[in-house]
């Protein structure tokens, strides 16, 4: 009675192919003959799963990085099969947005390029999609703006698709810096105020970064000694009647408003004294 190790040991994948990340994979350890009988099986990589009592291994929720597996059928000796590649297919991984240009902060009018990177994908054939607020913008790995505008600011994501699924980057905030614009002078309680009351002029603007310095001017283009967003006239006098405008400044530049006219009229008391 000649004793010998198990012969022609093979690791067989029972699943239909391809195997996808998250699948349950069943493998069997087959052999041709053995003397004495096979009493146990071993699986590599060792310690990755509990050793099954039978020559069948079930891998629950298989990972994208599970590469090769080998089994051994053992009697007094162990015979190892050649490793089999699971070849697990998975959606693209580690998708991220990278700004290619400009290298520094983005100013209105700049040419801007964003790149969609990912670390790996199987299968390798992928499609790219760029999205802002749920809307598809482009289908290339790069998203290009010839001349960026403040309206282009916002949250962008890039998506990479393969036949298994799609993966998104984290939201990427595109911030556009621009000089104060859309300046206007608003007047409270209105543009017609009775003398003796108070009038507040507010310099409203749209800017990024926000306006850091305001300058007020009168109808003679004389700068007034006020540098906050609000110009309060109290008590307001008839002599304050006229057109006013404001200028806003931030680190990018300056902007100015059109003229707004304030009319101050006499009170009944003043008219009665005349």
């Amino acid at each position: 009675d000649v004793q010998y190790p198990p012969k022609k040991v093979t690791t067989v994948i029972q699943n239909p192919m391809p195997i996808r990340e998250g699948d349950t994979v069943t493998l069997s350890c087959n052999y041709n003959s053995s003397n004495p009988s096979v009493t146990r099986y071993e699986w590599k990589p060792h310690g990755a799963w509990e050793e099954p009592s039978l020559g069948v291994l079930k891998i629950q929720n298989v990972g994208w990085d599970n590469t090769t597996i080998a089994c051994a059928a053992c009697n007094s000796w162990c015979s190892w099969a050649s490793p089999v590649a699971l070849n697990v297919q998975y959606a693209p991984r580690d998708v991220r947005v990278r700004k290619i240009k400009p290298l520094s902060e983005i100013h209105s009018g700049n040419s801007v390029s964003l790149q969609c990177d990912f670390s790996s994908s199987h299968p390798k054939e992928v499609q790219f999609f760029w999205e802002k607020n749920g809307r598809l913008l482009g289908k290339e790995s790069q998203l290009n703006f010839d001349s960026i505008s403040p309206e282009d600011a916002g949250s962008y994501s890039c998506w990479v698709n393969n036949s298994i699924g799609q993966t998104a980057s984290k939201a990427w905030t595109l911030e556009v810096l621009y000089a104060p614009r859309r300046l206007r002078v608003s007047m409270s309680p209105g543009d017609q105020v009775m003398e003796g009351k108070s009038a507040t002029l507010t310099c409203e603007s749209d800017a990024n970064p926000p306006v850091s310095h305001y300058t007020w001017f009168d109808w003679n283009n004389q700068s007034l000694p006020y540098h906050s967003q609000k110009l309060r006239l109290e008590p307001v006098k008839v002599q304050h009647s006229g057109a006013y405008w404001c200028q806003g400044t931030n680190s990018v530049g300056k902007g100015r408003s059109p003229l707004s006219t304030l009319t101050v009229y006499y009170s009944p008391e003043t008219i009665g004294r005349r």
Partner: antibody, heavy 113, light 107 residues
Framework: EVQLQQSGPVLVKPGASVKMSCKAS????????MNWVKQSHGKSLEWIGI????????SYNQKFKGKATLTVDKSSSTAYMELNSLTSEDSAVYYC??????WGQGTSVTVSS | DVQITQSPSYLAASPGETITINCRTS??????LAWYQEKPGKTNKLLIY???TLQSGIPSRFSGSGSGTDFTLTISSLEPEDFAMYYC?????????FGGGTKLEIK
């Protein structure tokens, strides 16, 4: 006006499957992603997954992988979600949402024997 | 996944008052937080996204602030139609996750 019209309420037996629809109008369907969200009775919202209406590419919350399948039919501007192997845990209202800005009215699913 | 803790879960207030609702995330989400209003018989309404951007058509009495992990929704001068359920949601990464909700009721 953007509108997402979802299919009506359903009562199904445990173990069965259900396929609900979300018909979009008022915008170019393939220009936007479609999300699906679950709301169990008296509970908060859970994101199920998202589908690219142009490519059909999908991404799922790990919790709903194997439970939900998202598809689109561009010709009818309709998104679909199929739920399989239903249990009482799947009883909920399911919403489709274009990004975050427009939501359907919800489809109520009741699983009961 | 990003966890979100929303507080309070219940709030009673009177018309004209100003209220705040808070959301805290388990990790930094930059400024990518949205706020919704939910009312029976109506579709969910997006109020604010990216932390502080007011969605088109939403009254200016709604405002959002915060970045990183702490965010606040403020409703100033409450109107009768503002009494509803409010949810926050992070849109920094998938899977999107939601806060547990705040029920705003009339005192």
């Amino acid at each position: 006006e953007v509108q997402l019209q979802q299919s009506g309420p359903v009562l199904v037996k445990p173990g069965a499957s259900v396929k609900m629809s979300c018909k979009a109008s008022g915008y170019t369907f393939s220009d936007y992603f479609m999300n699906w969200v679950k709301q169990s009775h008296g509970k908060s919202l859970e994101w199920i997954g998202i589908i690219n209406s142009y490519s059909g590419g999908t991404s799922y919350n790990q919790k709903f992988k194997g439970k939900a399948t998202l598809t689109v039919d561009k010709s009818s501007s309709t998104a679909y979600m199929e739920l399989n192997s239903l249990t009482s845990e799947d009883s909920a209202v399911y919403y489709c949402a274009r990004w975050m800005d427009y939501w359907g009215q919800g489809t109520s699913v009741t699983v009961s024997s | 996944d990003v966890q979100i803790t929303q507080s309070p879960s219940y709030l009673a207030a009177s018309p004209g008052e100003t209220i705040t609702i808070n959301c805290r995330t388990s990790e930094s989400i930059s400024k990518h937080l949205a706020w919704y209003q939910e009312k029976p018989g109506k579709t969910n309404k997006l109020l604010i996204y990216s932390g502080s951007t007011l969605q088109s058509g939403i009254p200016s009495r709604f405002s959002g602030s915060g970045s990183g992990t702490d965010f606040t929704l403020t409703i100033s001068s409450l109107e009768p139609e503002d009494f509803a359920m409010y949810y926050c949601q992070q849109h920094n990464e998938y899977p999107w996750t939601f806060g547990g909700g705040t029920k705003l009721e009339i005192k």
